[in-house]
Interface confidence: low
């Protein structure tokens, strides 16, 4: 995955000038009304704003920006279409517009900045490649089963946080928390076997940029499918069974009977 480029002078022409408001637009400055933080949708004529909330975090950064796309580009992709559309309609197109880019740091003035840095999160649901949804089967267990209609409300909404970890072109480290609950998927040894569990954490301290390794999964995208590899136990993946209503678990095999491929659906905040 490419390093974020130095800010070119032509890009700087569209920079707001306020170091707390790092936003750019394809067509030059306009009034910004919306935020990229939670993947909320902007008006069709709007841009996308990335807000750095504290001056500290500009310390030690290489001067950088991700590519930001005006919604005009999205409109061209979707023409012809109604003037208003739902976020779910857009989620299909996000992968074509936005690429998750790691931000590389030269140095940190203080290790604490890593812990305290704002964490980018998005809300989503996951379905396995058989279209089974993930639901709570009890306080600390997830199970996978086919849901229809109103029962879809039972599926777990994850808060996927983009955290610090070993990154490469095809691996993005994430933590998978349950939305509005202080539970995170974690990988631990139980009876000498890597095991997936839901772990309670102190909500005051999570999510954080530097998550403990047991909470970190490498999100791997292959052919529009996602895999979630344990950072703690390489080559062990979040898995589901072919059978209905069975626990979600950590599996050590890919391409076998167990399912390790998932699709992600964006959920509005």
């Amino acid at each position: 995955m490419a390093e974020v480029p130095e800010l070119a002078s032509e890009m700087m022409a569209y920079y707001s000038g306020n170091e707390d408001d790092l936003f750019f637009e394809a067509d030059g400055p306009k009034q910004m009304k919306c935020s990229f933080q939670d993947l909320d949708l902007c008006p069709l004529d709007g841009g996308i704003q990335l807000r750095i909330s504290d001056h500290h975090y500009s310390k030690g950064f290489r001067q950088a920006a991700s590519v930001v796309v005006a919604m005009d580009k999205l409109r061209k992709m979707l023409v012809p279409c109604p003037q208003t559309f739902q976020e779910n309609d857009l989620s299909t197109f996000f992968p074509f517009i936005f690429e998750e880019e790691p931000i590389f740091f030269d140095t940190w003035d203080n290790e604490a900045y890593v812990h305290d840095a704002p964490v980018r999160s998005l809300n989503c649901t996951l379905r396995d490649s058989q279209q089974k949804s993930l639901v709570m089967s009890g306080p600390y267990e997830l199970k996978a089963l086919h849901l229809q209609g109103q029962d879809m409300e039972q599926q777990v909404v994850f808060s996927m946080s983009f955290v610090q970890g070993e990154e490469s072109n095809d691996k993005i480290p994430v933590a998978l928390g349950l939305k509005e609950k202080n539970l995170y998927l974690s990988c631990v040894l139980k009876d000498d076997k890597p095991t997936l569990q839901l772990e309670s954490v102190d909500p005051k301290n999570y999510p954080k940029k530097k998550m403990e390794k047991r909470f970190v999964f490498n999100k791997i995208e292959i052919n529009n499918k996602l895999e979630f590899e344990s950072a703690q136990f390489p080559n062990w993946y979040i898995s589901t069974s072919q059978a209905e209503n069975m626990p979600v678990f950590l599996g050590g095999t890919k391409g076998g009977q167990d399912i390790t491929d998932f699709t992600m659906q964006f959920v509005s905040s």
Partner: antibody, heavy 118, light 107 residues
Framework: EVQLVQSGAEVKKPGESLKISCKGS????????IGWVRQMPGKGLEWMGI????????RYSPSFQGQVTISADKSISTAYLQWSSLKASDTAMYYC???????????WGQGTMVTVSS | EIVLTQSPATLSLSPGERATLSCRAS??????LAWYQQKPGQAPRLLIY???NRATGIPARFSGSGSGTDFTLTISSLEPEDFAVYYC?????????FGQGTKLEIK
Amino acid sequence: EVQLVQSGAEVKKPGESLKISCKGSGYSFTSYWIGWVRQMPGKGLEWMGIIYPSDSDTRYSPSFQGQVTISADKSISTAYLQWSSLKASDTAMYYCARYTNWDAFDIWGQGTMVTVSS
Amino acid sequence: EIVLTQSPATLSLSPGERATLSCRASQSVSSYLAWYQQKPGQAPRLLIYDASNRATGIPARFSGSGSGTDFTLTISSLEPEDFAVYYCQQRSNWMFPFGQGTKLEIK
């Protein structure tokens, strides 16, 4: 209508065994945990244990571990609470309740009164 | 093991008044807290789940708040049918303890 219907009141002697039931209807019985709650006369609610009927995964409160057995027969959508040897102190109202994905018991049975007296 | 302590044990109020019931956990339970109402001779009824969400069919005069260790059930304007015993309940590590209850009685 989603409901849990419990078996009727029981009067037993100390040392006897007993199995009371809780039958679910109006929803997918195997997809929700069923909990058992005790209420002694004039007292508050005490959680005893919980079972997932689909695979009979069962968890007990330490206070009741070894004192009672919780089971389920998913083919007839029924959960059970049983004692192998009753004591006078087991006299209480026993409720079953469905545990939702939202961390609460949302549907309750009407209760089964168990009286143990010599 | 987490212990839930409810206060007061008994609350004497008149219809139309505002009732505030407290539930304190011995350690943080995040938002995993529910409130139940029980009337004499009846099974408990779920009022509030996840600390602040009203269960289906529960009147708007009932509201819940709090997180961590301190939680509150508020009844904005008491109706005659609201006089009952109220229990809080949470879950942590496969434990589902209830508080000892608050009896709300007519003054």
